[in-house]
Amino acid sequence: IVLRPSRVHNSEENTMRALTLKDILNGTFSYKTFFPNWISGQEYLHQSADNNIVLYNIETGQSYTILSNRTMKSVNASNYGLSPDRQFVYLESDYSKLWRYSYTATYYIYDLSNGEFVRGNELPRPIQYLCWSPVGSKLAYVYQNNIYLKQRPGDPPFQITFNGRENKIFNGIPDWVYEEEMLATKYALWWSPNGKFLAYAEFNDTDIPVIAYSYYGDEQYPRTINIPYPKAGAKNPVVRIFIIDTTYPAYVGPQEVPVPAMIASSDYYFSWLTWVTDERVCLQWLKRVQNVSVLSICDFREDWQTWDCPKTQEHIEESRTGWAGGFFVSTPVFSYDAISYYKIFSDKDGYKHIHYIKDTVENAIQITSGKWEAINIFRVTQDSLFYSSNEFEEYPGRRNIYRISIGSYPPSKKCVTCHLRKERCQYYTASFSDYAKYYALVCYGPGIPISTLHDGRTDQEIKILEENKELENALKNIQLPKEEIKKLEVDEITLWYKMILPPQFDRSKKYPLLIQVYGGPCSQSVRSVFAVNWISYLASKEGMVIALVDGRGTAFQGDKLLYAVYRKLGVYEVEDQITAVRKFIEMGFIDEKRIAIWGWSYGGYVSSLALASGTGLFKCGIAVAPVSSWEYYASVYTERFMGLPTKDDNLEHYKNSTVMARAEYFRNVDYLLIHGTADDNVHFQNSAQIAKALVNAQVDFQAMWYSDQNHGLSGLSTNHLYTHMTHFLKQCFSLSD
């Protein structure tokens, strides 16, 4: 159980106040984290409060301004990047968001040694992606879907690709579906460790169907946004990987990396690229039916100036119970011999664990084991492997950092974070300097977040980087809700839940219950993290109980739970929310006439299906930007979990699992449907179809659209959205305004 500190003295209680919706919308109680921008084993950069870029040397204790805020301000820079030789800094301004990760910007290069901006051969604008080489100060950038190279910032550019074309051919950057569902980055190019080679992906979207929607703007006529977007079963992008020698780029030009034969025989994806050395690269490929992944290690052949990927260096990862990997197929972390690697995948018991692969996957040596999961490998050094897991005290929603000594035999394991600030910190991530000489720990909760700096050899804490003192002080007179994380055991399924309780919670009273659901495959909602958000307000001020439940399909509790939803989305996720609600009612403090459910995106889909389940449990509910039919969503995501919408595959369940098919069942609930009209991700089409089905069934419902807003409903729309949803819930629960 995680209880926020309760304050029971009456004298104190009088001075304390509940959270307000305004607090949440203004971000009054937001926290800060500190991630050092490492530039060596013992140095990092950080942007100071007054916007100077400051270099800190941990060993000397010295710090100095490397770039003045005057320079940042002169071009309205919102971001920066130091070249590895420390001669130059790129300054990023005119940020213009595209999709989740992608944006364009204007880039200026500042010469640190000469104290002035680089003139001559300036960068074009806007640029889609720009990065320094790992050594020196070469620049690679993408402009109008083509890749360019500069040996030095002031040099003329060398054009690497020429076929780039908007919405057709993408070089060095992903198309929509690869960005959102496969790479989770804005870039698709990778420098080799010493900057000798540059690898890049080319995505051909020529044959992909286009989603078109209106962007209303301020003009007399709306404009149409067109995005090549493969929905389930549609034609996919065609991907090719090339590598170019950046020292002599014109000599042989880009060389294509061959695709493994077993992958190339049918539709496939490229999933990631990892450089091992300057002359060895590792590519990961995935069949369109995403239960077979191939890791291919390729070597540079000097004589032919080509890349060779021998079959003996192909490693196959296959799932017989679900899809390959978790949300994504994990990436390898290579050891110093430059051929063996560490990787997370399912063990024989169906738990994701670290394995060491020296020759074949079959002979992999399991490094971690147990009925818990290894989540991320942070760093492998000569003698240590740092990773995170949810092993400690068997709470799946925690994250601790562990160190395994791989230099000694047998390897010994140490939890670096488990006992540091045990009550305050149970959910960590880490950021390591070169050779793991030092590292920063960022604790996200359940207490107020704190970031600390540590010695990589001894794990000793060196200093606190950010402890959110102002937040701590601001919260002193706030009546925060209580939070508890517990589990329900139902029919051999463990359902972990987080309950957020009003500050003066009394088990003998009855409270309205709001279920907040996401529930997507490989997601996790029940986490030991700090948050002061909308649901905190609903508990603190409006006296609601809020519950989050991780049901079947969610992550980090083994493959049985994770893959339970394989090919059957929309069934067990909903069942488990309903089961949990019934258990909560049995606890005795829930008013069963006042139960609501809400969710966003996948959560909007689940909340809609739960409302239409015919159980009579829910009085009302909200779906924000829901998926309504899996035929409307992206191929890469949907097919991973559902297969193809074809007769000989899984069309039947595609049809059975739509929200529209259950339109009649909304008759006895109050339903609020919300969507942004410019949602590039879950298209407005989804809500349009729900609305049409409800109208055709003559079912009353409420709806709100947000013109020109995407899947995030940001800016002023956020305020409007939460105000609107609050009114809806208060009305549903008969709470006075």
Partner: antibody, heavy 124, light 113 residues
């Protein structure tokens, strides 16, 4: 009045190194980069390299890379230029000069004040 | 590297007469963003360091007599001494500070005829 005062003349043997200092005064040291320029007898002025005292980062002319090291001691408002593996062609007067840091994108400044020069003679 | 070429190499002018020195750069020194030319002129007298006369091709450094003027843009520049004085006997150098490495012209020696 701004001053850049250089160390005295040096006579060095081929293969040796020379380190010339440039002590500055009466201005804010970290607001100007320091550059080193040499002038061999009857030759044009030749830029060797420079350094930004604000961050200690040097920049060298490729011609001298590997042989020259430019450093600063901000506490003493002094810049240093060390040239190694000396040869007879390195016989020249070596000047330090200051150049205002251009914080703005539209700026860019010439070298407005120079040291008096240091004669370095390389002879066996 | 940008190559700077001065002409003539030497120049003899009578006192009170106009002296004109040309400087040509191998690439443009005009910066499109601010429409400024990154070119400076220096005067060097025997046994002395160079002294800045003109920057941005045509702006006089403070304290420099107004008989010294600079003109030109792009790749072609001129330093003019409108009325030569005895104290103007020196070597004059043009220098580009558009990009690195900084480069100088070979110098023009101005003498009295």
């Amino acid at each position: 009045q701004v001053q850049l005062v250089q160390s005295g003349a040096e006579v060095k043997k081929p293969g040796a190194s020379v380190k010339v200092s440039c002590k500055t005064s009466r201005y804010t040291f970290t607001e100007y980069t320091i550059h080193w320029v040499r002038q061999a007898p009857g030759q044009r002025l030749e830029w060797i390299g420079g350094i930004n005292p604000e961050n200690g980062i040097p920049n060298y002319n490729q011609k001298f890379k590997g042989r020259v090291t430019i450093t600063v001691d901000t506490s003493a408002s002094t810049a240093y230029m060390e040239l190694s593996s000396l040869r007879s062609e390195d016989t020249a007067v070596y000047y330090c000069a200051r150049r205002r840091i251009a914080y703005g994108y539209d700026e860019g400044h010439a070298m407005d004040y120079w040291g008096q020069g240091t004669l370095v003679t390389v002879s066996s | 590297d940008i190559v700077m070429t001065q002409s003539p190499d030497s120049l003899a002018v009578s006192l009170g007469e106009r002296a004109t020195i040309n400087c040509k750069s191998s690439q443009s020194l005009l910066y499109s963003r601010n429409q400024k030319n990154y070119l400076a002129w220096y005067q060097q007298k025997p046994g002395q360091p160079p002294k800045l006369l003109i920057f941005w091709a045509s702006t006089r450094e403070s304290g420099v007599p107004d008989r010294f003027s600079g003109s030109g843009f792009g790749t072609d520049f001129t330093l003019t001494i409108s009325s030569l004085q005895a104290e103007d006997v020196a070597v004059y150098y043009c220098q580009q500070y558009f990009s690195y490495p900084l480069t100088f012209g070979q110098g023009t020696k101005v003498e009295i005829k």
